[in-house]
Interface confidence: medium
């Protein structure tokens, strides 16, 4: 007789979740020799331990601490790239600019990127049918708490000039409710971070507005300045051109300004 299982509003755990996490871990440690010391079986055990047998609306950051400890990794100063609502371009950028890193370029972010997972109270099963939705069910679910935990840590360890890529096509270019706005901004350490530089990515080809003057960017500037961190903003008018110029900086057409710089 099938057991009764809680029905959540969100999609269930990604198929072959354990295999995918282990495979990603092994691949990551092979590609990054500095992480060769990581035991992927222990990583999976710690990941599993964070949510298996636990009520999936009562997950805490504490649950993920063993995993966070195993995945400890540092980014060189000036090399952290945060992003909000523009993941694909941020990842395309770090794939070209190999010395800059988004959270998903780090072990723990890479393991979980685009995956969903949850368990259920008092059983060792993974729930492949449904998982809690952040809005409809609860915010303290395994996936949301994971990203909050690792995003906090990523921001806390950043140093030098930190960059953030923001989506200029959205009504709220800076959204206080995003992971960047609610977690990362507040966990940058003023004693280690000299400045935050925002790159506002334009969507339309003919869009020549100065989106650095957008009210939500002013709001971001205010929050950052109050935390004694300097703020800069750049318009990236042509993201395609921007990526092309990152790939081929010697290209003559790249010497002309592809962005506009604001110092504050």
């Amino acid at each position: 007789v099938p057991r009764w299982r809680q029905q959540w509003s969100g999609s269930g755990t990604t198929s072959r979740f354990p295999e995918t996490v282990l495979a990603r871990c092994v691949k990551y440690t092979e590609v990054h020799p500095e992480m060769r010391h990581v035991d992927c079986q222990s990583v999976w055990d710690a990941f599993k331990g964070a949510f298996i047998s636990k009520y999936p609306c009562n997950i805490t950051e504490e649950d993920y601490q063993p995993l966070v400890k195993l995945g400890t990794q540092t980014v060189p100063c000036n090399k952290t790239l945060l992003w909000s609502r523009i993941k694909d371009l941020a990842h395309q950028f770090t794939q070209v600019q190999r010395d800059m890193f988004t959270l998903e370029d780090m072990l723990l972010g890479y393991l979980a990127d685009d995956l969903t997972w949850c368990g259920e109270f008092n059983t060792f099963e993974i729930n492949y049918q449904s998982c809690p939705d952040w809005r409809k069910d609860c915010s303290n679910n395994p996936v949301s708490v994971f990203w909050k935990t690792v995003s906090r840590r990523f921001a806390e360890t950043a140093c030098g000039v930190v960059h953030v890529m923001l989506n200029g096509s959205r009504s709220k270019i800076f959204d206080k409710n995003s992971t960047f706005g609610s977690v990362e901004v507040h966990n940058l350490q003023p004693e280690k971070v000299q400045a935050l530089e925002a790159w506002v990515i334009h969507g339309g080809r003919e869009d020549s507005r100065d989106l650095c003057q957008d009210p939500t960017i002013k709001e971001l500037e205010s929050i950052i300045s109050k935390r004694n961190i300097r703020f800069f903003c750049k318009n990236i008018y042509r993201p395609d051109k921007f990526l092309q110029c990152v790939k081929n900086p010697e290209d003559s057409s790249c010497l002309s300004g592809i962005h506009h710089h604001h110092h504050h």
């Epitope: 072959r16 295999e19 282990l22 495979a23 691949k27 092979e30 020799p33």
Partner: antibody, heavy 121, light 107 residues
Framework: QVQLVQSGAEVKKPGSSVKVSCKAS????????ISWVRQAPGQGLEWMGG????????VYAQKFQGRVTITADESTSTAYMELSSLRSEDTAVYYC??????????????WGQGTLVTVSS | EIVMTQSPATLSVSPGERATLSCRAS??????LAWYQQKPGQAPRLLIY???TRATGIPARFSGSGSGTEFTLTISSLQSEDFAVYYC?????????FGQGTKVEIK
């Protein structure tokens, strides 16, 4: 018993592309990395790149970056290696090989029979 | 990339004798080293991995040793079927790299 069966020999013109297939049977195709290794006539072995089918994200040796594309079709348990802009130096036997540990790219305990690719005008 | 150097290029040995093949890495590869045997017209065959662990079905006369940058493959008593080319391969750092091979021929 794991078997890797590769497609047949190819003769190609300089500047063209070649796509070699490697069909796996036995074992869980998705979880084991498939690598491609080539061997020019009378020469040693050269690793070109590999893929874990479950992840679908290949890794390439710098030398072949931009010229090689490695893919895997889980539904048919087949891996593919496509090499473009062929030149005479690409004449070689191309092997597919399977990593001996789950998820890991190496070392290689199962090998295909090899596919001879001849590049000649 | 890590350069693997094998020596000698050719080793002439009589059947029943001991053969010692060397492999040096340009930087440490820990114990992430494998040895392969290849006969003419055939695909390579895995002999040793982890520098010293014999692969399934490999006779006890084959043994591997070393770690870091210096490795050795020893064939304690050469049989006629052992005459072939032997390659070492590191799988510590991408890209995986092979040595140029040592040909073991009949003296």
């Amino acid at each position: 018993q794991v078997q890797l069966v590769q497609s047949g020999a190819e003769v190609k013109k300089p500047g063209s592309s070649v796509k070699v297939s490697c069909k796996a049977s036995g074992g869980d195709f998705s979880l084991y990395a498939i690598s491609w290794v080539r061997q020019a006539p009378g020469q040693g072995l050269e690793w070109m790149g590999g893929i874990i089918p479950l992840l679908g994200e290949p890794v390439y040796a710098q030398k072949f970056q931009g010229r090689v594309t490695i893919t895997a079709d889980e539904s048919t348990s087949t891996a593919y290696m496509e090499l473009s802009s062929l030149r005479s130096e690409d004449t070689a036997v191309y092997y597919c090989a399977r990593g001996h540990r789950v998820y890991s790219s190496s070392p290689f305990d199962y090998w295909g029979q090899g596919t001879l690719v001849t590049v000649s005008s | 990339e890590i350069v693997m150097t094998q020596s000698p290029a050719t080793l002439s040995v009589s059947p029943g004798e001991r053969a010692t093949l060397s492999c040096r890495a340009s930087q440490s590869v820990s114990s992430n080293l494998a040895w392969y045997q290849q006969k003419p017209g055939q695909a390579p065959r895995l002999l040793i991995y982890g520098a010293s662990t014999r692969a399934t079905g490999i006779p006890a006369r084959f043994s591997g040793s070393g770690s870091g940058t210096e490795f050795t493959l020893t064939i304690s008593s050469l049989q006629s079927e052992d005459f072939a080319v032997y390659y070492c391969q590191q799988y510590n750092n991408w890209p995986w790299t092979f040595g140029q091979g040592t040909k073991v021929e009949i003296k």
